[in-house]
């Protein structure tokens, strides 16, 4: 059988000879060299060599336990002549013994950590960890103790755990933000002769809201012209807060003052400034100075710091309204006037008035914007604003005239205002009714008396208030002995009726009927229109076959029946 125990070997051997490990030996070995010892497994033939005759094992290289703590090899004892094993192949272990040749190494070369300012003593900051590659199961080579080399009295470290804690009360970020702490890890339980490593911990105090906003001055003064429209920024105020980020955010509000309704304050989120803006239209002539009380406050407050006082501050803002030379102001935004279309030239239609709103009350002159009255139909009295006609009007040509009147300060022509004038032309009965179309019709030779051969329609350019009422009649000169009659339908239409039985186109091929159309407005207007009637041969249905003259092209749908 094999005769050996577990082999032990000290790491980091520095001798000049190979390091002796031990001897493999079989009790079958007679010592005559008839056996051959063979080594296989971890490092065999390289790290570990065997004298094949004696079984002596040696290590050829310096071994590092931290690289490999255990080597597992196999041994054979074989009869050199036959190759026959005299023992079963067997596994054995070479265990590498530790020496303290590794210093503790921190998991990071540099740690970064944060802790809120004003934290209580003993507040956890960060845990640092150092590992020692030496054997933790043997001696104290890997027993690490932590200590602080730099960073007192602000911070401390727990020797066993590497937990860094705050050690000083009321550490104020606004006073100092960054701390560099150096921690040492030492093996051998911190004893003399132990190996050590260090790491740097960069600790940043994070902000808490322990500072209120403060205005750098108690009073601000701004000027703004009275013409500033609502929303116009007129000045910026800024309170400063020693905190940062959310803790330095400021909200501005107007809390008091006679300008409370006239001005607003908005917070610029980027610059943390309060912007005073115009809320309502200003009027220098009414009020020249306003005072406001503006408050700056932190929206987020930490209750534990309320004992330091209110987290707000206020300042007085004085706003001076500056006078602006304003243009004249018309009494109305627009004027609507009316005039009859038969008005004579120089007829007054109405008037406009404008006043300078400034304290100076500068006199005003009026004029018509000629771009809006190219035909110069209207004029204005430059002194009193009276509008009058300068040409005759015609409602039927243009119902509405839209013109612009300008009011200009006499002392400062640059200051002017404009107002629209809408002038409606009222209707006068100055147009006669007339036929709606040209009428040319026919009558059959065999027509019976009182047959309707044409319906007449009329139109009138006027627009009477109560609507059109037309009357139709034959002209007096044609009324007696006429072959046709006009029947007024009392609905603004009339019919032409035959007056006898039968017509002879050879005797009279064409009749011209003068018809008088009248309206019933004042003054009455009338006109005479002529209707041409041709006599034609018709079939027994009353359809035209031929006329003495050229064939008629009859309007579609016109009834010619008996």
């Amino acid at each position: 059988s094999w005769m050996w125990n577990q082999f032990f070997l000290l790491e980091e051997y520095t001798g000049s000879d190979y390091q002796y490990v031990g001897k493999l030996h079989s009790d079958q070995d007679r010592g005559d060299g008839s056996l051959k010892y063979i080594l296989s497994g971890d490092g065999a033939g390289d790290l570990f060599i065997i004298n094949e005759n004696t079984g002596d094992i040696q290590a050829t290289k310096r071994l590092d336990r931290e690289e490999k703590p255990v080597y597992i090899l196999r041994a054979q004892a074989i009869n050199r002549r036959t190759g026959r094993p005299v023992e079963p192949e067997s596994e054995f272990i070479i265990k590498i013994h530790d020496i303290n040749d590794n210093e503790p190494i921190f998991t990071k070369e540099v740690y970064t950590a944060t802790v809120p300012e004003m934290s209580d003593v003993g507040t956890f900051v960060v845990q640092v960890t150092a590992t020692d590659a030496d054997d933790p199961t043997y001696g104290n080579s890997a027993k690490v103790v932590y200590s602080i080399l730099q960073g007192q009295p602000y911070f401390s470290v727990e020797s066993e755990t590497g937990i860094i804690k705050t050690a000083l009360l009321n550490m104020d970020r606004e006073n100092r933000e960054q701390y560099q702490v150096v921690i040492q890890a030492k093996d051998m339980g911190g004893q003399m002769g132990g190996l050590s490593g260090t790491t740097t911990v960069n600790i940043t105090l994070t902000d808490v809201n322990d500072n209120p906003p403060r205005f750098p001055q108690s009073t601000y003064q701004f000027k703004t012209p009275e013409s500033s429209p609502p929303g116009t920024p007129i000045g910026r105020i800024k309170a400063s807060d020693a905190d940062v980020g959310e803790n330095a955010e400021i909200e501005y509000s107007i809390t008091d003052g006679e300008g409370l309704d006239m001005f607003d304050v908005i917070t610029d989120q980027e610059t943390q400034e309060g912007i005073i803006t115009v809320k309502k239209l200003l009027d220098f002539e009414k009020k020249k100075v306003y005072t406001l009380k503006v408050e700056a406050s932190n929206p987020y407050v930490e209750p534990r710091f309320l004992y330091l006082g209110p987290f707000k501050d206020s300042a007085t803002v004085r706003i001076v309204v500056e006078d602006v030379d304003e243009p004249p102001v018309f009494s109305k935004l627009a004027y609507i006037l009316q005039i009859r279309e038969d008005a004579q030239i120089n007829t007054t239609i109405g008037s406009v008035t404008a006043q300078d709103p400034d304290a100076a009350r500068n006199p005003v002159k009026y004029s018509v914007d000629r771009h809006t009255d190219m035909d110069r139909i209207f004029n204005i009295d430059s002194g009193n604003g009276s509008i009058f006609t300068s040409k005759l009007l015609d409602r039927e040509t243009l119902l509405w005239h839209n013109i612009t009147v300008i009011a200009t300060e006499i002392n400062n022509p640059k200051q002017s205002s404009r107002v629209p004038l809408y002038i409606k032309v009222l209707d006068v009965n100055d147009n006669a009714p007339e036929f709606a179309e040209f009428y040319e019709t026919f009558v059959c030779e065999k027509a019976k008396a009182d047959q309707l051969i044409q319906t007449l329609h009329a139109v009138d350019k006027d627009d009477p208030y109560s609507g059109h009422q037309f009357s139709f009649s034959l002209a007096p000169e044609a009324a007696s002995g006429s072959n046709f009659t006009i029947q007024d339908n009392k609905d603004n239409t009339a019919g032409i009726l035959t007056r006898k039985n039968g017509y002879n186109r050879h005797e009279m091929s064409t009749y011209l009927l003068p018809v008088v159309i009248s309206d019933n407005d004042y003054p009455v207007q009338s006109s005479t229109g002529t209707v041409t009637v041709r006599v034609c041969a018709c079939d027994h249905h009353g359809n035209m076959q031929s006329c003495h003259a050229e064939a008629l092209i009859h309007p579609t749908g016109l009834s010619t029946g008996a």
């Epitope: 005559d32 074989i78 050199r80 002549r81 036959t82 190759g83 026959r84 094993p85 023992e87 079963p88």
Partner: antibody
Framework: EVQLVQSGAEVKKPGSSVKVSCKAS????????MHWVRQRPGQGLEWMGD????????HYTQKFKDRVTITVDKSTSTAYMELSSLRSEDTAVYYC??????????WGQGTTVTVSS | DIVMTQSPDSLAVSLGERATINCRAS??????????MHWYQQKSGQPPKLLIY???NLESGVPDRFSGSGSETDFTLTISSLQAEDVAVYYC?????????FGGGTKVEIK
């Protein structure tokens, strides 16, 4: 390079003896056993015996035990095989071979011995 | 003596085909997991050449188309893809017990 060089062919009379040499080179002669194997014409291989050059310990097959003698000269790294009382059936090619853990890893070129009256 | 019986006596195989030679020992030649069985190749007019030792270990310089397997009494030499230069007589040999003995040989030829 390991080499085993054998002596030349021999023609012998029945009843006489023959001594074949085998000179080794390219390795430590005393570290390996030297074996002798013969091959009769058209036949297979037949192990005759071996010797440990460091101690001159020998082993012979029963068939040749009385007639074969294997020796070495360590100074010249040469092994010898002497076969006596030759008969016609001893006509064969005789090989020396280096033994390592029961296997023959290097062989001589062979020596032809002819036994004829 | 341990008798080594090889089969077949001769074998004709096509180029590129597998050739398998068997060797049976009259008793076990294995001990402690070591199989004391070795294989040789002998070409015409030349001394034998070691191919496989301890049943399955390929001797240095021998092509890997040769392989050995087996234990106790039954062993096999396999040529996975026969080449023209593999034409030879193949012998098995045991070193388990004196006298060391060889198989009768198997002649391998090209079909």
């Amino acid at each position: 390079e390991v080499q085993l060089v054998q002596s030349g062919a021999e023609v012998k009379k029945p009843g006489s003896s023959v001594k074949v040499s085998c000179k080794a080179s390219g390795y430590t002669f005393t570290n390996y056993w030297m074996h002798w194997v013969r091959q009769r014409p058209g036949q297979g291989l037949e192990w005759m015996g071996d010797i440990d050059p460091s101690h001159s310990e020998t082993h012979y097959t029963q068939k040749f035990k009385d007639r074969v003698t294997i020796t070495v000269d360590k100074s010249t790294s040469t092994a010898y095989m002497e076969l006596s009382s030759l008969r016609s059936e001893d006509t064969a090619v005789y090989y020396c071979a280096r033994g390592d853990l029961g296997r023959f890893d290097y062989w001589g070129q062979g020596t032809t011995v002819t036994v004829s009256s | 003596d341990i008798v080594m019986t090889q089969s077949p006596d001769s074998l004709a195989v096509s180029l590129g085909e597998r050739a398998t030679i068997n060797c049976r020992a009259s008793e076990s030649v294995s001990i402690h997991g070591t199989h004391l069985m070795h294989w040789y190749q002998q070409k015409s007019g030349q001394p034998p050449k070691l191919l496989i030792y301890a049943a399955s270990n390929l001797e240095s310089g021998v092509p890997d188309r040769f392989s050995g397997s087996g234990s106790e009494t039954d062993f096999t030499l396999t040529i996975s893809s026969l080449q023209a230069e593999d034409v030879a007589v193949y012998y098995c040999q045991q070193s388990f017990e004196d006298p060391w003995t060889f198989g009768g040989g198997t002649k391998v030829e090209i079909k």
